[in-house]
Amino acid sequence: IWSAVFLNSLFNQEVQIPLTESYCGPCPKNWICYKNNCYQFFDESKNWYESQASCMSQNASLLKVYSKEDQDLLKLVKSYHWMGLVHIPTNGSWQWEDGSILSPNLLTIIEMQKGDCALYASSFKGYIENCSTPNTYICMQRTV
Amino acid sequence: IWSAVFLNSLFNQEVQIPLTESYCGPCPKNWICYKNNCYQFFDESKNWYESQASCMSQNASLLKVYSKEDQDLLKLVKSYHWMGLVHIPTNGSWQWEDGSILSPNLLTIIEMQKGDCALYASSFKGYIENCSTPNTYICMQRTV
């Protein structure tokens, strides 16, 4: 978060930013930036694998929920969207695309139908769904 | 949008940002930044006047809907929240806190009950409600 001095190289002048204010990002153009994470909601319905590929093509991944505090904007998301959570049948656990295991108490997992993928819905709910079912999806990019 | 060179004054080094990426803001700390507007959703229920005062105290105003394209993140907002739209009984029009008139076709206006204030709900709907009814609210700050 850069809240001190910003160099506008075009005009070579300093822009003062109040210390209570800050820039967020960097994010892909026209993505949502919140607490230095980038999010985008995609309207077109794809299955989980196509959704994952779409996010990867944009240098991002499907939504990973890692913190109710840092991601409290997700509380108010309407509808159901693919996130990057998959079921590992061998050990019965749920894990994210990056291989990390779903932390307990982060999501309420609800079985919509038999499946190995999960949809995100408001108030930190995860709905189990068949991975080949088309749905809208959320991509996320964590800034460094 | 600053997507060229960013001066990190602390370390006095240039950080290269890909041209497809950009910073968003500046916004108050921990607000949502989207297309260079800042948004915050407040959980506590207040009447319209208290909600307006709360936003003003944060150098912001209640949500103003001015563009379906620039504010398409509002499509997916769950629940009902005060926005800065009020009914002017003298001429029957709906106007924003800044005095501008609601543009036609921006919001579908639905009467919940007799009232002079409006709640924002997903998919660009505005619900007419009594101004003294407590509700959650959305503050917005437009960046220059």
Epitope: - | K78, T108, I110, M112, Q113
Partner: antibody, heavy 124, light 108 residues
Framework: EVQLLESGGGLVQPGGSLRLSCTAS????????MSWVRQAPGKGLEWVSL????????YYADSVKGRFTNSRDDSRNTLYLQMNSLRAEDTAVYYC?????????????????WGQGTTVTVSS | DIQLTQSPSFLSAFVGDRVTITCRAS??????LAWYQQKPGKAPKLLVY???TLQSGVPSRFSGSGSGTEFTLTVSSLQPEDFATYYC??????????FGPGTKVDIK
């Protein structure tokens, strides 16, 4: 003028089917939830079913669940109640009503517009 | 399920009388209670919603009050056109509506 007009009532045998219609005018039909309420002869009001403004959610009284289907066609400003496996106890005047129930909202503002009712008689 | 009871089930009154009808819920229903008036052979008419808000066009002699489990509809000065049956209605369960059994108000 805000109006609701029901039709489709009549005499039907037990086990039979009937479809009621309710045509709306004078308000933005697609913006409101709609309910069906019935009243058996000489009895009080009984809520039957509600359909949300979008049509994506429908709710039913236990007494009709699995037998009645509430649907809407916003392009025709029309609400429907498909009634199957009818029983003698379904005999009633059926009213449709504009319902100020808003999904997920904390307050309920009642059924503010009612049709004149259509009579359904289930008898052999 | 939430049950509603109304008392009295029947009352006789003179024109000009102050009349109070009570509606009790079997459990708390916040302020989600409405009152309807129905005349013979006619559809019900919404009088009061959200416990105490008068529906547009309803005369001010009608008023509603209460909270939790006990609610009242009051007619401050009964008029000839007020002789009818009155029903309370709740929404608490999501969404399942219940009507009270009704109170018939007759001319004495």
């Amino acid at each position: 003028e805000v109006q609701l007009l029901e039709s489709g009532g009549g005499l039907v045998q037990p086990g039979g089917s009937l479809r009621l219609s309710c045509t709306a005018s004078g308000f933005t039909f697609s913006s409101y939830a709609m309910s069906w309420v019935r009243q058996a002869p000489g009895k009080g009001l009984e809520w039957v079913s509600l359909i949300s403004e979008s049509g994506s959610s429908t709710y039913y009284a236990d007494s009709v669940k699995g037998r009645f289907t509430n649907s809407r066609d916003d392009s025709r400003n029309t609400l429907y109640l498909q009634m199957n496996s009818l029983r003698a106890e379904d005999t009633a005047v059926y009213y449709c009503a504009k319902d100020r129930w808003f999904e997920g909202y904390h307050s309920y503002y009642g059924m503010d517009v009612w049709g004149q009712g259509t009579t359904v008689t289930v008898s052999s | 399920d939430i049950q509603l009871t109304q008392s009295p089930s029947f009352l006789s009154a003179f024109v000009g009388d102050r009349v109070t009808i009570t509606c009790r819920a079997s459990q708390g229903i916040s302020n989600n209670l409405a009152w309807y008036q129905q005349k013979p052979g006619k559809a019900p008419k919404l009088l009061v919603y959200a416990t105490s808000t008068l529906q547009s066009g309803v005369p001010s002699r009608f008023s509603g009050s209460g909270s939790g489990t006990e609610f009242t509809l009051t007619v401050s000065s009964l008029q000839p056109e007020d002789f009818a049956t009155y029903y309370c209605q709740q929404l608490k369960s999501y969404p399942s509506f219940t009507f009270g059994p009704g109170t018939k108000v007759d001319i004495k």
